[in-house]
């Protein structure tokens, strides 16, 4: 069977070479070759090469548009997963661990405190912080969480806060905060969470997490 | 009611020293950036320097940076403005100003009377 | 720094006139431009913020557009409390910046 088909290959690439010497010859004005045969086979051709254009104009445009849709507005997501701190500091941690998602390199995970993003628009942006607090032991001020923004050139923005009391249970009760909200962000615009009390969080699997996704 | 009230201006001669206070009373002081704008006499509004709510950012215009430094005291509800090497381009009408903190754009909603400095020998 | 270039520097208009004051910034900075007025002797008093943001209290004839690197101001008909002189800022990115100002005076 293949042997048969290499012979037809071969046939038929014959034709085709023979088609082409035929259009060269007509081409060329040779006499032996009448005015009809060379009219017909000149539409011939002519109706392959349209073909062939149409069809490369056709995958230009699809390459094109495909372009335009992966290029001008690309999905642009991020979710990071809380990351214990030696750090004093209140502003939380975050890493790229367990079920995180970084969509691209137009969101970043800077220092491993804020998401940076290098395009301008809506964002959805949230964070939920899970603590752990006993009423004795902590202070009298309630545990508050901030959701704050960054410009490159201007200063720092609380864009959410949500506070909750501290629990009586002993050693410490458990609470979540939850933070969400539509923001416009301009390019390099970072954002990051800060909460009254760092050592209070609990970074147990899925407990405090923080993200962002272009709308 | 939101007030600012601003002191310390006064005749000092090129090359010295002035402390300029701003006592703002009337809003929770610690949850604004504040500013100081001055104005040239006869002339548009110049704005010399920044700072964010905590105290941990400061921002300065070129022709201050080195010179002037700007801070607060939050538990005093007070914005300074240390102005040192001062020259006769310094003179002018110094205004302290709060920065709206509920917006994106940072205008400055509430500005004091202004305090004059005047640098000349 | 941003520069920002206010026009026209002055203009006389009479009361009831709409009056169109623009400002164009060196480089582009979204919607980060606010409009203060300052009358002699006094403080200036934010009018819009964001562009086209009205302030709380000031009166709706005031209005602001544009966006990018052309913003104007326009006063829909002149009162005779409106005569002052106007600035536009940027707050894009420190050092804020102000345009040179326009002062509309009295035809």
């Known amino acids: 069977h293949r042997r048969l088909d290499k012979i037809e290959d071969e046939r038929n690439l014959h034709e085709d070479f023979v088609f082409m010497k035929t259009i060269q010859r007509c081409n060329t004005g040779e006499r032996s070759l009448s005015l009809l045969n060379c009219e017909e086979i000149k539409s011939q051709f002519e109706g392959f090469v349209k073909d062939i254009m149409l069809n490369k104009e056709e995958t230009k445009k699809e390459n094109s548009f495909e372009m335009q849709k992966g290029d001008q507005n690309p999905q642009i997501a991020a979710h990071v997963i809380s990351e214990a701190s030696s750090k004093t500091t209140s502003v939380l941690q975050w890493a790229e661990k367990g079920y995180y998602t970084m969509s691209n390199n137009l969101v970043t995970l800077e220092n491993g405190k804020q998401l940076t993003v290098k395009r301008q628009g809506l964002y959805y942006i949230y964070a939920q912080v899970t603590f752990c607090s006993n009423r004795e032991a902590s202070s009298q001020a309630p545990f508050i969480a901030s959701l704050c923004l960054k410009s490159p050139g201007r200063f720092e923005r609380i864009l959410l806060r949500a506070a909750n009391t501290h629990s009586s249970a002993k050693p410490c009760g458990q609470q979540s905060i939850h933070l969400g909200g539509v923001f416009e962000l301009q390019p390099g615009a970072s954002v990051f969470v800060n909460v009254t009390d760092p050592s209070q969080v609990s970074h147990g699997t899925g407990f405090t997490s923080f993200g962002l996704l272009k709308l | 009611e939101v007030q600012l009230l601003e002191s310390g201006g006064g005749l000092v001669q090129p090359g010295g020293s002035l402390r300029l206070s701003c006592a703002a009373s009337?809003?929770?002081?610690?949850?604004?950036?504040m500013s100081w704008v001055r104005q040239a006499p006869g002339k548009g509004l110049e704005w010399v320097s920044g700072?964010?709510?905590?105290?941990?950012?400061?921002y300065y215009a070129d022709s201050v940076k080195g010179r002037f430094t700007i801070s607060r005291d939050n538990s005093k509800n007070t914005l300074y403005l240390q102005m040192n090497s001062l020259r006769a381009e310094d003179t002018a009408v110094y205004y302290c100003?709060?920065?709206?903190?509920?917006?994106?754009?940072?205008?400055?909603?509430?500005w004091g009377q202004g305090t004059l400095v005047t640098v000349s020998s | 720094d941003i520069q920002m270039t206010q026009s026209p520097s002055s203009l006389s208009a009479s009361v009831g006139d709409r009056v169109t004051i623009t400002c164009r910034t060196s480089?582009?900075?979204?919607?980060?431009a606010n409009w203060y007025q300052q009358k002699p002797g006094k403080a200036p008093k934010l009018l819009i913020y964001?562009?086209?943001r009205l302030e709380s209290g000031v009166p709706s004839r005031f209005s602001g557009s544009g966006s990018g690197t052309d913003f104007t101001l326009t006063i829909s008909s002149l009162q005779p409390e409106d005569f002052a002189t106007y600035y536009c800022?940027?707050?894009?990115?420190?050092?804020?910046?102000f345009g040179g100002g326009t002062k509309v005076g009295i035809k």
């Open positions: 100003a709060r920065d709206s903190s509920g917006s994106y754009y940072y205008p400055l909603d509430y």
């Open positions: 009337g809003f929770t002081f610690s949850d604004y950036d």
């Open positions: 700072i964010s709510g905590s105290g941990a950012t400061t």
């Open positions: 480089q582009s900075i979204s919607s980060y």
């Open positions: 964001g562009a086209s």
């Open positions: 800022q940027q707050t894009y990115s420190t050092p804020w910046t």
